[in-house]
Protein backbone atom coordinates (compact mmCIF):
# COMPACT_ATOMS: atom_id res chain seq x y z
CA UNK A 1 0.00 0.00 0.00
CA UNK A 2 1.20 3.50 -0.77
CA UNK A 3 0.36 6.59 1.21
CA UNK A 4 0.85 9.92 -0.53
CA UNK A 5 0.24 13.18 1.26
CA UNK A 6 0.78 15.20 -1.91
CA UNK A 7 -1.60 15.61 -4.81
CA UNK A 8 -2.33 12.03 -5.86
CA UNK A 9 -1.15 12.83 -9.38
CA UNK A 10 2.42 13.05 -8.13
CA UNK A 11 2.52 9.28 -7.51
CA UNK A 12 1.12 6.52 -9.68
CA UNK A 13 1.66 2.81 -10.01
CA UNK A 14 3.29 1.39 -13.16
CA UNK A 15 4.63 -2.06 -13.91
CA UNK A 16 5.63 -2.90 -10.38
CA UNK A 17 7.17 0.44 -9.62
CA UNK A 18 6.21 4.00 -8.85
CA UNK A 19 5.98 6.88 -11.28
CA UNK A 20 6.69 10.24 -9.66
CA UNK A 21 5.57 13.23 -11.70
CA UNK A 22 7.24 16.62 -11.38
CA UNK A 23 5.23 19.40 -13.00
CA UNK A 24 6.65 22.61 -14.42
CA UNK A 25 5.17 25.59 -16.32
CA UNK A 26 4.70 25.08 -20.07
CA UNK A 27 6.53 28.35 -20.72
CA UNK A 28 9.78 26.81 -19.46
CA UNK A 29 12.03 25.91 -22.38
CA UNK A 30 15.25 24.83 -20.68
CA UNK A 31 15.45 23.32 -17.22
CA UNK A 32 16.96 20.93 -14.74
CA UNK A 33 14.62 18.74 -12.70
CA UNK A 34 15.87 16.77 -9.71
CA UNK A 35 14.00 14.21 -7.67
CA UNK A 36 14.92 14.00 -4.00
CA UNK A 37 14.14 11.35 -1.43
CA UNK A 38 14.66 13.26 1.80
CA UNK A 39 18.09 14.85 1.17
CA UNK A 40 19.29 12.35 -1.41
CA UNK A 41 19.17 13.14 -5.14
CA UNK A 42 17.70 10.08 -6.85
CA UNK A 43 17.30 11.44 -10.37
CA UNK A 44 18.37 14.43 -12.39
CA UNK A 45 17.23 15.44 -15.86
CA UNK A 46 18.49 18.48 -17.76
CA UNK A 47 16.95 19.79 -20.96
CA UNK A 48 18.81 22.50 -22.87
CA UNK A 49 18.77 23.90 -26.39
CA UNK A 50 21.71 24.76 -28.60
CA UNK A 51 22.14 27.72 -30.92
CA UNK A 52 20.19 25.97 -33.67
CA UNK A 53 17.36 25.05 -31.30
CA UNK A 54 18.54 21.43 -31.12
CA UNK A 55 17.47 19.84 -27.86
CA UNK A 56 19.89 18.10 -25.50
CA UNK A 57 18.63 15.82 -22.75
CA UNK A 58 21.08 14.76 -20.06
CA UNK A 59 20.21 12.00 -17.60
CA UNK A 60 23.45 11.48 -15.66
CA UNK A 61 21.92 9.22 -13.02
CA UNK A 62 20.40 7.01 -15.74
CA UNK A 63 16.88 7.11 -14.35
CA UNK A 64 13.90 5.85 -16.26
CA UNK A 65 11.90 8.94 -17.18
CA UNK A 66 9.34 10.53 -19.46
CA UNK A 67 9.60 14.18 -20.44
CA UNK A 68 6.67 16.19 -21.74
CA UNK A 69 6.24 19.93 -22.25
CA UNK A 70 4.99 20.42 -18.68
CA UNK A 71 6.27 17.55 -16.58
CA UNK A 72 9.09 15.14 -15.95
CA UNK A 73 8.08 11.71 -14.68
CA UNK A 74 10.63 9.47 -13.04
CA UNK A 75 10.07 5.71 -12.69
CA UNK A 76 11.40 4.00 -9.59
CA UNK A 77 11.43 0.24 -9.95
CA UNK A 78 12.43 -0.55 -6.40
CA UNK A 79 11.30 2.26 -4.15
CA UNK A 80 12.77 2.00 -0.66
CA UNK A 81 10.13 0.18 1.38
CA UNK A 82 12.09 0.02 4.63
CA UNK A 83 10.59 3.25 5.83
CA UNK A 84 8.28 6.04 4.79
CA UNK A 85 10.09 8.63 2.70
CA UNK A 86 9.37 12.18 1.65
CA UNK A 87 9.87 12.76 -2.07
CA UNK A 88 10.01 16.17 -3.72
CA UNK A 89 11.11 17.72 -7.00
CA UNK A 90 13.55 20.60 -7.42
CA UNK A 91 13.30 22.72 -10.56
CA UNK A 92 16.01 24.97 -12.03
CA UNK A 93 14.73 27.22 -14.81
CA UNK A 94 17.38 28.34 -17.32
CA UNK A 95 15.04 29.66 -19.99
CA UNK A 96 13.16 31.94 -20.04
CA UNK A 97 15.29 34.22 -17.87
CA UNK A 98 15.90 35.10 -15.14
CA UNK A 99 17.45 31.94 -13.73
CA UNK A 100 15.30 30.50 -10.95
CA UNK A 101 15.48 27.56 -8.58
CA UNK A 102 12.47 26.30 -6.69
CA UNK A 103 11.44 23.24 -4.74
CA UNK A 104 8.12 21.90 -5.96
CA UNK A 105 5.52 20.39 -3.66
CA UNK A 106 6.39 16.95 -2.42
CA UNK A 107 4.71 13.90 -1.01
CA UNK A 108 5.16 11.21 1.59
CA UNK A 109 5.35 7.67 0.22
CA UNK A 110 5.09 4.56 2.34
CA UNK A 111 5.09 1.09 0.81
CA UNK A 112 3.57 -1.55 3.06
CA UNK A 113 3.73 -4.52 0.70
CA UNK A 114 7.13 -6.03 0.16
CA UNK A 115 6.49 -5.78 -3.55
CA UNK A 116 4.31 -3.41 -5.50
CA UNK A 117 2.11 -5.81 -7.31
CA UNK A 118 -1.53 -5.36 -7.27
CA UNK A 119 -3.03 -2.03 -6.48
CA UNK A 120 -2.38 1.49 -5.44
CA UNK A 121 -4.08 3.18 -2.51
CA UNK A 122 -3.63 6.82 -1.76
CA UNK A 123 -4.84 8.95 1.05
CA UNK A 124 -4.82 12.68 0.55
CA UNK B 1 14.10 -20.50 -22.47
CA UNK B 2 13.33 -16.81 -22.40
CA UNK B 3 11.27 -15.09 -19.79
CA UNK B 4 9.78 -11.76 -20.75
CA UNK B 5 7.72 -9.69 -18.38
CA UNK B 6 6.82 -7.23 -21.12
CA UNK B 7 4.38 -7.60 -23.97
CA UNK B 8 5.46 -10.80 -25.71
CA UNK B 9 5.71 -8.98 -29.02
CA UNK B 10 8.77 -7.14 -27.73
CA UNK B 11 10.91 -10.29 -28.00
CA UNK B 12 10.94 -12.91 -30.71
CA UNK B 13 13.29 -15.63 -31.84
CA UNK B 14 15.14 -15.29 -35.16
CA UNK B 15 18.02 -17.28 -36.59
CA UNK B 16 19.71 -18.05 -33.32
CA UNK B 17 19.30 -14.58 -31.92
CA UNK B 18 16.66 -12.35 -30.42
CA UNK B 19 14.67 -9.68 -32.19
CA UNK B 20 13.65 -6.85 -29.88
CA UNK B 21 10.86 -4.66 -31.22
CA UNK B 22 10.44 -1.04 -30.15
CA UNK B 23 7.07 0.37 -31.15
CA UNK B 24 6.34 4.05 -31.82
CA UNK B 25 3.28 5.99 -33.04
CA UNK B 26 2.77 6.05 -36.81
CA UNK B 27 2.46 9.83 -36.71
CA UNK B 28 6.14 10.15 -35.78
CA UNK B 29 8.22 11.26 -38.75
CA UNK B 30 11.65 11.89 -37.23
CA UNK B 31 12.96 10.03 -34.23
CA UNK B 32 15.80 8.45 -32.32
CA UNK B 33 15.28 4.98 -30.87
CA UNK B 34 17.74 3.51 -28.40
CA UNK B 35 17.80 0.00 -26.99
CA UNK B 36 19.12 -0.38 -23.45
CA UNK B 37 20.20 -3.46 -21.55
CA UNK B 38 19.97 -2.25 -17.98
CA UNK B 39 21.89 1.06 -18.20
CA UNK B 40 23.93 0.22 -21.29
CA UNK B 41 22.96 1.51 -24.72
CA UNK B 42 23.20 -1.46 -27.09
CA UNK B 43 21.75 0.10 -30.23
CA UNK B 44 20.77 3.52 -31.50
CA UNK B 45 18.91 4.40 -34.68
CA UNK B 46 18.10 7.95 -35.79
CA UNK B 47 15.75 8.78 -38.64
CA UNK B 48 15.66 12.41 -39.80
CA UNK B 49 14.52 14.23 -42.90
CA UNK B 50 16.48 16.86 -44.79
CA UNK B 51 15.23 20.01 -46.44
CA UNK B 52 14.23 18.12 -49.58
CA UNK B 53 12.45 15.50 -47.46
CA UNK B 54 15.33 13.09 -48.07
CA UNK B 55 15.48 10.54 -45.25
CA UNK B 56 18.70 10.06 -43.30
CA UNK B 57 19.21 6.93 -41.18
CA UNK B 58 22.07 6.92 -38.70
CA UNK B 59 23.11 3.66 -37.05
CA UNK B 60 26.30 4.60 -35.18
CA UNK B 61 26.53 1.37 -33.18
CA UNK B 62 26.17 -0.71 -36.35
CA UNK B 63 23.31 -2.83 -35.07
CA UNK B 64 21.27 -5.11 -37.28
CA UNK B 65 17.86 -3.50 -37.51
CA UNK B 66 14.59 -3.26 -39.37
CA UNK B 67 12.72 0.04 -39.53
CA UNK B 68 9.03 0.27 -40.32
CA UNK B 69 6.57 3.15 -40.01
CA UNK B 70 5.67 2.18 -36.44
CA UNK B 71 8.55 0.17 -35.03
CA UNK B 72 12.29 -0.35 -34.94
CA UNK B 73 13.46 -3.93 -34.48
CA UNK B 74 16.99 -4.66 -33.34
CA UNK B 75 18.57 -8.10 -33.82
CA UNK B 76 20.94 -9.36 -31.13
CA UNK B 77 22.94 -12.35 -32.25
CA UNK B 78 24.55 -13.16 -28.94
CA UNK B 79 22.38 -11.87 -26.14
CA UNK B 80 24.12 -11.98 -22.77
CA UNK B 81 23.03 -15.27 -21.23
CA UNK B 82 25.14 -15.06 -18.11
CA UNK B 83 22.30 -13.44 -16.21
CA UNK B 84 18.80 -12.16 -16.66
CA UNK B 85 18.73 -8.67 -18.11
CA UNK B 86 16.12 -5.97 -18.37
CA UNK B 87 15.79 -4.51 -21.87
CA UNK B 88 13.88 -1.36 -22.75
CA UNK B 89 13.58 1.11 -25.58
CA UNK B 90 13.99 4.87 -25.33
CA UNK B 91 12.26 7.03 -27.93
CA UNK B 92 13.08 10.65 -28.81
CA UNK B 93 10.49 12.31 -31.04
CA UNK B 94 11.79 15.20 -33.15
CA UNK B 95 8.86 15.51 -35.53
CA UNK B 96 6.05 16.30 -35.09
CA UNK B 97 6.81 18.85 -32.35
CA UNK B 98 7.00 19.37 -29.47
CA UNK B 99 10.17 17.40 -28.81
CA UNK B 100 9.54 14.49 -26.44
CA UNK B 101 11.60 11.75 -24.89
CA UNK B 102 10.05 8.69 -23.34
CA UNK B 103 11.18 5.32 -22.13
CA UNK B 104 8.96 2.64 -23.61
CA UNK B 105 7.88 -0.43 -21.73
CA UNK B 106 10.62 -2.96 -21.29
CA UNK B 107 11.02 -6.62 -20.60
CA UNK B 108 13.12 -9.03 -18.63
CA UNK B 109 14.99 -11.55 -20.75
CA UNK B 110 16.57 -14.69 -19.35
CA UNK B 111 18.15 -17.27 -21.62
CA UNK B 112 18.31 -20.71 -20.05
CA UNK B 113 19.52 -22.69 -23.03
CA UNK B 114 23.18 -22.36 -23.89
CA UNK B 115 22.09 -21.54 -27.42
CA UNK B 116 18.87 -20.05 -28.68
CA UNK B 117 17.82 -22.72 -31.07
CA UNK B 118 14.40 -24.02 -30.94
CA UNK B 119 11.63 -22.09 -29.36
CA UNK B 120 10.65 -19.07 -27.41
CA UNK B 121 8.66 -19.17 -24.20
CA UNK B 122 7.32 -16.11 -22.54
CA UNK B 123 5.54 -15.61 -19.31
CA UNK B 124 3.77 -12.37 -18.78
Amino acid sequence: EINGSADHRMFSFHNGGVQISCKYPETVQQLKMRLFREREVLCELTKTKGSGNAVSIKNPMLCLYHLSNNSVSFFLNNPDSSQGSYYFCSLSIFDPPPFQERNLSGGYLHIYESQLCCQLKLWL
Amino acid sequence: EINGSADHRMFSFHNGGVQISCKYPETVQQLKMRLFREREVLCELTKTKGSGNAVSIKNPMLCLYHLSNNSVSFFLNNPDSSQGSYYFCSLSIFDPPPFQERNLSGGYLHIYESQLCCQLKLWL
Epitope: T46, S51, A54, D95, P96 | -
Partner: antibody
Amino acid sequence: EVQLVESGGGLVKPGGSLTLSCAASGFTFSDYWMDWVRQGPGKGLEWVGNIDEDGSTTYYAPFVKGRFTISRDNAKKTLYLQMNSVKSEDTATYYCTRWGRYAFDSWGQGTLVTVSS
Amino acid sequence: DIVMTQSPSSLAVSPGDKVTINCKSSQSLLSGNYNYLAWYQQKTGQAPKLLIFYASTRHTGVPDRFMGSGSGTDFSLTINSFQTEDLGDYYCQHHYSTPPTFGPGTKLEIK
Protein backbone atom coordinates in the same frame (compact mmCIF):
# COMPACT_ATOMS: atom_id res chain seq x y z
CA GLU C 1 34.24 36.63 -15.18
CA VAL C 2 33.67 34.50 -18.26
CA GLN C 3 36.76 34.23 -20.44
CA LEU C 4 37.30 32.43 -23.74
CA VAL C 5 40.78 32.42 -25.27
CA GLU C 6 41.36 30.98 -28.74
CA SER C 7 44.70 29.74 -30.05
CA GLY C 8 46.13 27.71 -32.90
CA GLY C 9 45.46 30.02 -35.84
CA GLY C 10 48.05 30.75 -38.50
CA LEU C 11 49.00 30.18 -42.10
CA VAL C 12 48.01 26.90 -43.70
CA LYS C 13 48.20 25.65 -47.27
CA PRO C 14 45.06 24.67 -49.21
CA GLY C 15 44.23 21.04 -48.45
CA GLY C 16 46.08 21.25 -45.17
CA SER C 17 44.93 20.82 -41.58
CA LEU C 18 44.85 22.92 -38.47
CA THR C 19 43.43 22.55 -34.96
CA LEU C 20 42.08 25.53 -33.06
CA SER C 21 41.68 25.50 -29.29
CA CYS C 22 39.59 27.58 -26.95
CA ALA C 23 40.39 27.68 -23.23
CA ALA C 24 37.40 28.56 -21.07
CA SER C 25 37.34 29.94 -17.53
CA GLY C 26 35.03 31.75 -15.14
CA PHE C 27 32.02 29.45 -15.58
CA THR C 28 31.03 25.79 -15.40
CA PHE C 29 32.17 24.77 -18.87
CA SER C 30 30.38 21.41 -18.82
CA ASP C 31 26.98 23.12 -18.35
CA TYR C 32 26.96 24.90 -21.71
CA TRP C 33 26.70 24.24 -25.42
CA MET C 34 29.67 25.81 -27.21
CA ASP C 35 29.94 27.10 -30.79
CA TRP C 36 32.45 28.29 -33.36
CA VAL C 37 31.59 31.37 -35.44
CA ARG C 38 33.87 32.76 -38.13
CA GLN C 39 34.28 36.08 -39.93
CA GLY C 40 36.03 36.43 -43.26
CA PRO C 41 38.14 39.57 -43.85
CA GLY C 42 35.73 42.51 -44.21
CA LYS C 43 32.76 40.14 -44.11
CA GLY C 44 29.90 39.26 -41.79
CA LEU C 45 29.54 36.59 -39.13
CA GLU C 46 29.06 32.96 -40.16
CA TRP C 47 28.14 30.10 -37.84
CA VAL C 48 30.45 27.07 -38.17
CA GLY C 49 28.96 24.55 -35.74
CA ASN C 50 28.28 23.61 -32.15
CA ILE C 51 28.63 20.88 -29.57
CA ASP C 52 26.42 19.97 -26.64
CA GLU C 53 27.42 19.96 -22.98
CA ASP C 54 29.05 16.54 -22.79
CA GLY C 55 30.30 16.38 -26.37
CA SER C 56 27.90 13.67 -27.46
CA THR C 57 26.21 15.72 -30.19
CA THR C 58 27.56 18.12 -32.80
CA TYR C 59 25.94 20.16 -35.56
CA TYR C 60 27.66 21.87 -38.47
CA ALA C 61 26.96 24.50 -41.10
CA PRO C 62 26.39 23.14 -44.62
CA PHE C 63 29.70 24.52 -45.93
CA VAL C 64 31.63 22.31 -43.51
CA LYS C 65 30.66 19.11 -45.38
CA GLY C 66 32.64 16.76 -43.16
CA ARG C 67 35.86 18.78 -43.28
CA PHE C 68 35.68 20.18 -39.74
CA THR C 69 35.22 18.44 -36.41
CA ILE C 70 34.22 20.12 -33.17
CA SER C 71 35.14 18.41 -29.90
CA ARG C 72 35.60 19.32 -26.26
CA ASP C 73 37.48 18.20 -23.18
CA ASN C 74 35.41 19.18 -20.16
CA ALA C 75 38.14 18.19 -17.72
CA LYS C 76 40.48 20.67 -19.41
CA LYS C 77 37.68 23.20 -20.05
CA THR C 78 38.74 23.36 -23.67
CA LEU C 79 36.86 23.48 -26.97
CA TYR C 80 38.49 22.37 -30.25
CA LEU C 81 37.97 22.86 -33.96
CA GLN C 82 39.84 20.41 -36.15
CA MET C 83 39.99 21.79 -39.70
CA ASN C 84 40.89 19.42 -42.53
CA SER C 85 41.03 19.91 -46.32
CA VAL C 86 40.99 23.67 -45.86
CA LYS C 87 40.16 25.99 -48.76
CA SER C 88 40.99 29.61 -49.43
CA GLU C 89 37.41 30.56 -48.49
CA ASP C 90 38.08 29.25 -44.98
CA THR C 91 40.35 32.25 -44.40
CA ALA C 92 38.73 34.04 -41.47
CA THR C 93 38.92 34.98 -37.83
CA TYR C 94 37.46 32.09 -35.85
CA TYR C 95 35.60 32.91 -32.65
CA CYS C 96 34.84 30.53 -29.84
CA THR C 97 31.46 31.40 -28.31
CA ARG C 98 29.36 30.28 -25.38
CA TRP C 99 25.71 29.61 -26.11
CA GLY C 100 24.15 31.17 -23.01
CA ARG C 101 20.81 29.31 -23.39
CA TYR C 102 19.27 31.89 -25.76
CA ALA C 103 22.11 33.81 -27.44
CA PHE C 104 25.90 33.93 -27.84
CA ASP C 105 26.55 35.76 -24.59
CA SER C 106 30.35 35.39 -24.45
CA TRP C 107 32.94 35.52 -27.24
CA GLY C 108 36.68 34.97 -27.41
CA GLN C 109 38.98 37.52 -29.02
CA GLY C 110 39.27 35.34 -32.14
CA THR C 111 42.16 33.61 -33.89
CA LEU C 112 43.05 34.28 -37.52
CA VAL C 113 43.35 31.41 -39.97
CA THR C 114 44.90 32.23 -43.34
CA VAL C 115 44.68 29.65 -46.12
CA SER C 116 47.20 30.40 -48.84
CA SER C 117 49.79 28.64 -50.92
CA ASP D 1 18.03 27.49 -44.21
CA ILE D 2 16.47 30.67 -42.87
CA VAL D 3 17.83 33.74 -44.65
CA MET D 4 18.31 36.95 -42.67
CA THR D 5 18.40 40.34 -44.39
CA GLN D 6 19.23 43.72 -42.88
CA SER D 7 18.62 47.31 -43.93
CA PRO D 8 20.24 49.65 -44.38
CA SER D 9 23.66 48.15 -45.01
CA SER D 10 25.27 51.34 -43.70
CA LEU D 11 24.08 54.51 -42.03
CA ALA D 12 25.73 57.84 -41.27
CA VAL D 13 24.56 59.22 -37.94
CA SER D 14 25.22 62.05 -35.51
CA PRO D 15 25.36 61.91 -31.70
CA GLY D 16 21.87 62.21 -30.24
CA ASP D 17 20.17 60.77 -33.34
CA LYS D 18 17.53 58.10 -33.09
CA VAL D 19 18.76 55.16 -35.13
CA THR D 20 16.69 52.25 -36.42
CA ILE D 21 18.11 49.11 -38.01
CA ASN D 22 15.76 46.58 -39.61
CA CYS D 23 16.09 42.83 -39.84
CA LYS D 24 13.88 40.46 -41.81
CA SER D 25 13.80 36.66 -41.74
CA SER D 26 12.65 34.41 -44.56
CA GLN D 27 10.29 32.60 -42.20
CA SER D 28 8.68 33.31 -38.85
CA LEU D 29 10.94 33.10 -35.81
CA LEU D 30 8.03 32.99 -33.38
CA SER D 31 7.72 29.85 -31.28
CA GLY D 32 5.36 29.84 -28.35
CA ASN D 33 5.63 33.33 -26.90
CA TYR D 34 9.21 33.83 -28.01
CA ASN D 35 10.88 35.22 -31.10
CA TYR D 36 14.19 33.43 -31.54
CA LEU D 37 16.20 36.45 -32.57
CA ALA D 38 19.26 38.22 -31.09
CA TRP D 39 21.18 41.41 -31.87
CA TYR D 40 24.96 41.89 -31.59
CA GLN D 41 27.27 44.88 -31.74
CA GLN D 42 30.80 44.60 -33.10
CA LYS D 43 33.29 47.43 -32.80
CA THR D 44 36.29 47.59 -35.12
CA GLY D 45 38.95 45.03 -34.20
CA GLN D 46 36.83 43.51 -31.44
CA ALA D 47 34.67 40.43 -30.98
CA PRO D 48 30.89 40.84 -31.19
CA LYS D 49 28.90 41.56 -28.02
CA LEU D 50 25.35 40.51 -27.24
CA LEU D 51 22.85 43.35 -26.98
CA ILE D 52 19.36 41.85 -27.24
CA PHE D 53 17.90 38.35 -27.07
CA TYR D 54 14.39 37.04 -27.65
CA ALA D 55 13.93 40.05 -29.97
CA SER D 56 13.33 42.54 -27.15
CA THR D 57 15.14 41.54 -23.93
CA ARG D 58 18.26 43.56 -23.14
CA HIS D 59 21.31 41.60 -22.09
CA THR D 60 22.87 42.39 -18.70
CA GLY D 61 24.75 45.69 -18.71
CA VAL D 62 23.39 46.93 -22.05
CA PRO D 63 22.34 50.62 -21.84
CA ASP D 64 18.61 51.22 -22.01
CA ARG D 65 18.96 53.39 -25.11
CA PHE D 66 19.13 50.09 -27.03
CA MET D 67 15.69 48.65 -27.73
CA GLY D 68 14.66 45.60 -29.72
CA SER D 69 11.19 45.10 -31.15
CA GLY D 70 9.24 43.12 -33.72
CA SER D 71 7.76 39.67 -34.10
CA GLY D 72 7.42 36.91 -36.66
CA THR D 73 9.58 37.93 -39.60
CA ASP D 74 10.14 41.67 -39.06
CA PHE D 75 12.40 43.04 -36.34
CA SER D 76 14.21 46.25 -35.53
CA LEU D 77 16.93 47.53 -33.25
CA THR D 78 16.56 51.14 -32.12
CA ILE D 79 19.24 53.30 -30.50
CA ASN D 80 17.25 56.12 -28.93
CA SER D 81 20.09 58.59 -28.56
CA PHE D 82 23.15 57.55 -30.52
CA GLN D 83 26.51 57.98 -28.74
CA THR D 84 29.92 57.89 -30.45
CA GLU D 85 30.78 54.70 -28.56
CA ASP D 86 27.92 53.01 -30.44
CA LEU D 87 29.90 53.12 -33.70
CA GLY D 88 30.40 49.72 -35.29
CA ASP D 89 28.59 46.90 -37.04
CA TYR D 90 25.27 45.47 -35.89
CA TYR D 91 24.09 41.96 -36.68
CA CYS D 92 20.82 40.15 -36.13
CA GLN D 93 20.84 36.37 -35.72
CA HIS D 94 18.12 33.74 -35.49
CA HIS D 95 18.24 30.54 -33.46
CA TYR D 96 14.94 29.11 -34.60
CA SER D 97 16.55 26.14 -36.37
CA THR D 98 19.88 24.70 -37.51
CA PRO D 99 21.87 26.35 -38.91
CA PRO D 100 21.47 29.57 -36.97
CA THR D 101 22.28 32.39 -39.38
CA PHE D 102 23.30 36.02 -39.09
CA GLY D 103 22.15 39.00 -41.10
CA PRO D 104 24.77 40.64 -43.34
CA GLY D 105 25.24 43.49 -40.87
CA THR D 106 24.62 47.23 -40.70
CA LYS D 107 27.55 49.62 -40.32
CA LEU D 108 27.01 52.80 -38.30
CA GLU D 109 29.37 55.64 -39.20
CA ILE D 110 29.68 59.23 -38.05
CA LYS D 111 28.02 61.75 -40.33
